[in-house]
C-alpha cells in the first residue's frame, strides 16, 4: 500500500491521544535505553510503511503484535486516514485469524514495540533530519 | 460496500447496562474502526466514539465502552448506568475519514422502569 | 467540542424548488464536513464528504460548497424523494460532531 495519500495529521491526533500510551502499557517494566534503536525512517510515508510493517507482519520471535490493542488502533486510524488501505488488508486480516494463538510477551517483541516507538516518534517529526 | 448487521432491540431498567453487537461483512476492514452514534426520538444524530476517538462526547465519559473482535468483524457498544434519556436507536457506521457512508439497520434502546 | 450550527431547522418547499441548507461551525474545520439524507425510521445516507465531494450513487442535484467555518448543502431541483432531514458533520475535531438537522418539509 502507498501511504502518500494519507492524513498524517489526522494519524497523529490518532497516535498521541491513544495508540502512543498502548504502546507505553505495553512497555511498562522496561528501560526506556533497555533497546537501541535499528530501524528508521525518511519521510511520512516511509514511517508508515515501516509502522505497518513491524506491527502486523510476523518476526522471528515475536509472532503476535498484530492482536495489541496499540496493533488495533494502529490498523484502525489507517483504515480511517489512508484512503483505500481497507481494501488491501483481505490477506494479511485472513492470515491474523488462522494465526490466533496464545500471547506470549516475549525480549524479542518488546525490543520490536521499542522499535515502533521511535518510528512513530520519527512520524510526528517529519521535518527533522535523518540522523 | 460494507454490510453492518447490528443486535435486535432491547429494554432495560435505569441503572443497567446495554451491549450492542454490530457484525461486519461484505468488505475488508478493521472492525476497531468502527464509530457509533445514536438518536434519541425526534432527535438528531449524536456522536457517541470509535475505539481511537478517545476523547468519547463528554456526555458519554465514563458510560460507554467500544470494544471488536477481530476474529469475527464484531464491534461492540456497551452503555452502563443507562437513564430514561438513553432511549434512543443506535447505530453503528464505517466510512473512511469518518465519511459514514456504511450503517447498521440500529438497535433501538428502551430504558423504562 | 466543536459545535455545529444549522440552518434553516426546518424548511417547507415544493418540488423543482432550489433549497440551501447552510451549516456554521465553531472553529475552523478547514474542508472536513460530510453532508447526511435521513427519512424516518431509516438510517443516515451520506450525500456528500470533504465539503464538495458527491458520493457514489448521489444524484448531481445535490452539491456542497465551503471551507474553514461556513457550509453549504444546495439541491438544484427538489424532487419528490428529496423530503428528508439533513445533517452536516464535522470531522476535523475529536469527537466528530453533527449539526442538529433541517428538515425539508412539502410546502
Known amino acids: 500500500y502507498d501511504f502518500t495519500n494519507c492524513d498524517f495529521e489526522k494519524i497523529k491526533a490518532a497516535y498521541l491521544s491513544t495508540i502512543s500510551k498502548d504502546l507505553i502499557t505495553y512497555m511498562s517494566g522496561t528501560k526506556s535505553t533497555e533497546f537501541n534503536n535499528t530501524v528508521s525512517c525518511s519521510n511520512r510515508p516511509h514511517c508508515l510503511t515501516e509502522i505497518q510493517s513491524l506491527t502486523f507482519n510476523p518476526t522471528a520471535g515475536c509472532a503476535s503484535l498484530a492482536k495489541e490493542m496499540f496493533a488495533m488502533k494502529t490498523k484502525a486510524a489507517l483504515a480511517i486516514w489512508c484512503p483505500g488501505y481497507s481494501e488491501t488488508q483481505i490477506n494479511a486480516t485472513q492470515a491474523m485469524k488462522k494465526r490466533r494463538k496464545r500471547k506470549v510477551t516475549t525480549n524479542k517483541c518488546l525490543e520490536q514495540v521499542s522499535q515502533l516507538q521511535g518510528l512513530w516518534r520519527r512520524f510526528n517529526r517529519p521535518l527533522l533530519k535523518q540522523q | 460496500q460494507v454490510q453492518l448487521v447490528q443486535s435486535g432491540a432491547e429494554v432495560k431498567k435505569p441503572g443497567s447496562s446495554v451491549k450492542v453487537s454490530c457484525k461486519a461483512s461484505?468488505?475488508?476492514?478493521?472492525?476497531?474502526?468502527i464509530s457509533w452514534v445514536r438518536q434519541a426520538p425526534g432527535q438528531g444524530l449524536e456522536w457517541m466514539g470509535g475505539i481511537i476517538s478517545i476523547n468519547y462526547a463528554q456526555k458519554f465519559q465514563g458510560r460507554v465502552t467500544i470494544t471488536a473482535d477481530e476474529s469475527t468483524s464484531t464491534a461492540y457498544m456497551e452503555l452502563s448506568s443507562l437513564r430514561s434519556e438513553d432511549t434512543a436507536v443506535y447505530y453503528c457506521?464505517?466510512?473512511?475519514?469518518?465519511?459514514?457512508?456504511?450503517w447498521g439497520q440500529g438497535t433501538l434502546v428502551t430504558v423504562s422502569s | 467540542d466543536i459545535q455545529m450550527t444549522q440552518s434553516p431547522s426546518s424548511l417547507s418547499a415544493s418540488v423543482g424548488d432550489r433549497v440551501t441548507i447552510t451549516c456554521r461551525a465553531s472553529?475552523?474545520?478547514?474542508?472536513?464536513l460530510n453532508w447526511y439524507q435521513q427519512k424516518p425510521g431509516k438510517a443516515p445516507k451520506l450525500l456528500i464528504y470533504s465539503a464538495s465531494s458527491l458520493q457514489s450513487g448521489v444524484p448531481s442535484r445535490f452539491s456542497g460548497s465551503g471551507s474553514g467555518t461556513d457550509f453549504t448543502l444546495t439541491i438544484s431541483s427538489l424532487q419528490p424523494e428529496d423530503f428528508a432531514t439533513y445533517y452536516c458533520?464535522?470531522?476535523?475535531?475529536?469527537?466528530?460532531?453533527f449539526g442538529q438537522g433541517t428538515k425539508v418539509e412539502i410546502k
Open positions: 472553529q475552523t474545520i478547514g474542508t472536513y
Open positions: 461484505g468488505g475488508t476492514f478493521s472492525t476497531y474502526a
Open positions: 457506521a464505517w466510512g473512511a475519514k469518518y465519511a459514514l457512508d456504511s
Open positions: 458533520q464535522q470531522t476535523d475535531g475529536n469527537p466528530p460532531t
